[in-house]
């Protein structure tokens, strides 16, 4: 009778140790359960110690000892006759002869269905002599077997011309079915058809699928594998998976879910993260996609001044990277933003509404109008200008910056005057006389100053002159200033 | 994970018997493998004694088959060592370790005990 | 018994050398060797099995080649941790263990 050994079995000593290039270092036993790494350990069958001989394939040899007396029958030890195990799983067996001394240059082949086994397999022939015979332990191991493993082992001795054959060892791999192709998660449009797919394979074959949804068998007859299920559509959320049978048992698939796809939710934590005159940097953290990916979004701005006529400005982006500067927007002033995005299906409401500041800016134009005239009588000259329109402004003025450049005979000299907001005069003191004096005038906010007015030049007598005239910023449209003495 | 220990008198005097025990921890012995004792004289290299399974079933050296013992005690998970007769040459570092048995019967040693100092002296 | 011979029995080398060393068996063995690490004071440790594949956690660096009699440990870029001696063993019979190379600081 053919001995068998399955994994659920101990019929023979079974000795432990990963195969090489396995995760493991702790060596665990045989039979444990396969292990989250996915290696499974080996099995191993060791030759029976000291074991009978077979009566099988027997090389009776003809030498004889001093004594004159006939050297026993050699035959290679019992072992293990059939070997049951799982695809990917590693085996190990041996064969076992022990060999009277005398006989030189022993050597041990393995050969499966007829063929010899050369090369790419994991064979070791160890030797371990005593007083008066050596034992001879022919190990054979498969570190991850496959279905075309399945076959009849033997090992075959060759000694003074005799061969001796051990029994058979047969290796089946078989198992559970093992899945080849198994359902994947999907995300589809509400009502309407998709494909699920399921394949395992054994042996033994044939595998039959039975479908299952939401823990409820869809298939009263089972289908032969590969099978492919049809959903007519889907109104809700629902799970399924597969269960593939054949003689060995079941195994079922993993369990995947199919969604509904839907609006997003809208986004939250809609931040802002840096603000300037006229620009506002915000971020928020997207809703739930509705399982099925964001397009585009949308940020919405409202002036939060109660007198706006309450238009919205909107600006589109891309869903990526859930930030967006807005741009041209009015300095000093207050908004609301809010944030929509979308996917295939549609767009989000918006967020929650955040209000947001633009900070004070450098006024965007000069002061206006601005007229210089020498005041002889007090060694001073005067200047005269009309603030910016207020719009222009971009902050609460805190005053001027007045820049007045003498020139005379190849010297020039730059002087910087600041003056409160209060007024639009001020008075500087004559430095150089007959010199050219240069004045711009620039507002300054706390945003910071703004550009200089169009540069006027008077020019200052020498001590004694008395006719004299204002000199004024030109009208729009003449290319220089004018001087007026 | 896997550990051994051994543990036994650090010295001997000659002609008597050294005596030293292998604990080993996170692993059952019943298991299988085999289980050897290696030692390694001062400054010398490394010297198999003999190797002992879970059944009590002994391969030894050669060179010292005659002095050696080697059993098991799988209900202590534990394996011991006996070397009669000692001279000073036996005195040595002793290790056990785990005999593997990946490709063959007995292959390479892994993992090993930390080893223990045996002095053969008077 | 299958005798095995290494070859240095010591050699000096600096961080970052290759080092070879050879290991003889005196009759064939296959693949059936291993290569040991030891550092003083310490059990020896696996690096290398059949010969050639590297033990699990072992730096790429150490390779292992050779079948039949003559085999060879690689290191190719010797790290001050590399410092140790190496052994050779056999498994094809009773096992045996090659004298040992030391790896000196050069």
């Known amino acids: 009778a053919i001995t068998e050994a399955r994994e659920e079995a101990k019929p023979y000593p079974l000795f432990p140790g990963p195969f090489p290039g396995s995760l493991q270092t702790d060596h665990t036993p045989l039979l444990s359960l396969p292990h989250a790494s996915g290696y499974q350990p080996a099995l191993m069958f060791s030759p029976t110690q000291p074991g009978r001989p077979h009566t099988g394939n027997v090389a009776i040899p003809q030498v004889t000892s001093v004594e004159s007396k006939p050297l026993p029958p050699l035959a290679f030890k019992h072992t293990v006759g059939h070997i049951i195990l799982s695809e990917h799983k590693g085996v190990k067996f041996n064969c076992s002869i022990s060999v009277p001394n005398i006989y030189q240059d022993t050597t041990i082949s393995w050969w499966k269905d007829g063929k010899e086994l050369l090369g790419a397999h994991h064979a070791i022939t160890q030797f371990y002599p005593d007083d008066e015979v050596t034992a001879i332990i022919a190990s054979f191991s498969i570190t991850s077997v496959q279905r075309s493993d399945n076959g009849s082992y033997i090992c075959k001795m060759k000694i003074n011309n005799e061969e001796i054959v051990s029994d058979p060892i047969y290796i089946e791999v078989q198992g559970l079915p093992h899945f080849t192709k198994q359902p994947e998660s999907m995300n589809v449009t509400r009502n309407t058809a998709f494909n699920l797919t399921c394949q395992a394979v054994g042996p033994p074959e044939p595998v039959n699928i039975f479908w299952v949804q939401n823990s409820s068998r869809v298939n009263e007859q089972p289908e032969k594998s590969p099978s492919v299920l049809t959903v007519p559509g889907l109104t809700e959320m629902a799970v399924f998976s597969c269960e593939a049978h054949n003689d060995k048992g079941l195994t079922v698939s993993k369990g995947v879910q199919i969604n509904i796809k839907a609006i997003p939710s809208p986004p939250t934590e809609v931040s802002i993260r840096n603000s300037t005159a006229h620009s506002i940097l915000i971020s928020w953290v997207p809703g739930f996609d509705g399982y099925s990916p964001f397009r585009n979004c949308s940020i919405q701005v409202k002036e939060a001044d109660p007198l706006s006529n309450g238009s919205v400005m909107i600006f589109n982006t891309s869903a990526l990277p859930h930030l967006y500067q807005i741009k041209q927007l009015q300095a000093l002033a207050n908004y609301s933003i809010g944030v929509s995005c979308m996917n295939e299906i549609g767009w989000s409401a918006v967020s929650p509404w955040i209000l947001a500041s633009t900070t004070e800016g450098a006024p965007s134009v000069a002061p206006l109008n601005v007229t210089v005239f020498l005041n002889e009588s007090s060694d001073n000259v005067d200047i005269r200008w009309m603030k910016p329109p207020t719009k222009q402004q971009d902050g609460e003025l805190v005053g001027y910056r007045i820049s007045h450049v003498w020139q005379s005979a190849g010297i020039s000299k730059e002087l910087l005057e600041e003056v409160g907001q209060n007024g639009s005069r001020a008075r500087i003191s004559v430095q150089v006389h007959n010199a050219t004096c240069t004045v711009r005038i620039a507002a300054v906010t706390r945003g910071g100053v703004g550009p200089f007015s169009d540069p006027v030049k008077i020019f200052i007598p020498a001590h004694g002159w008395v006719d004299y005239a204002p000199s004024s910023t030109p009208a729009p449209g003449n290319a220089d200033p004018v001087l007026i003495i | 994970q896997l550990q051994l220990q051994e543990s036994g008198p650090g010295l001997v005097k000659p002609s008597e018997t050294l005596s030293l025990t292998c604990a080993v921890s996170g692993y059952s012995i019943s298991s299988g493998n085999y289980w050897g004792w290696i030692r390694q004289s001062p400054g010398k290299g490394l010297e198999w004694i003999g190797s002992?399974?879970?059944?009590?079933?002994?391969y030894y050296s050669p060179s010292l088959k005659s002095r050696v013992t080697i059993s098991v005690d799988t209900s202590k998970n534990q394996f011991s060592l006996k070397l009669n007769s000692v001279t000073a040459a036996d005195t040595a570092d002793y290790y056990c370790?785990?005999?593997?048995?990946?490709?063959?019967?007995?292959?390479?040693?892994?993992?090993w005990g930390q080893g223990t100092l045996v002095t053969v002296s008077s | 018994a299958i005798q095995l011979t290494q070859s240095p029995s010591s050699l000096s080398a600096s961080v970052g050398d290759r080092v070879t060393i050879t290991c003889r068996a005196s009759q064939g063995i296959s693949s059936a060797l291993a290569w040991y690490q030891q550092k003083p004071g310490k059990a020896p440790k696996v690096l290398i099995y059949d010969a050639s594949s590297l033990e699990s956690g072992v730096p790429s660096r150490f390779s292992g080649s050779g079948s039949g009699t003559d085999f060879t440990l690689t290191i190719s870029s010797l790290q001050p941790e590399d410092f140790a001696t190496y052994y050779c063993?056999?498994?094809?019979?009773?096992?045996?263990f090659g004298q040992g190379t030391k790896v000196e600081i050069k």
């Open positions: 002992v399974d879970h059944s009590g079933s002994t």
């Open positions: 063993q056999q498994f094809r019979s009773y096992p045996t």
């Open positions: 370790a785990r005999n593997t048995m990946i490709r063959g019967v007995m292959d390479w040693f892994d993992p």
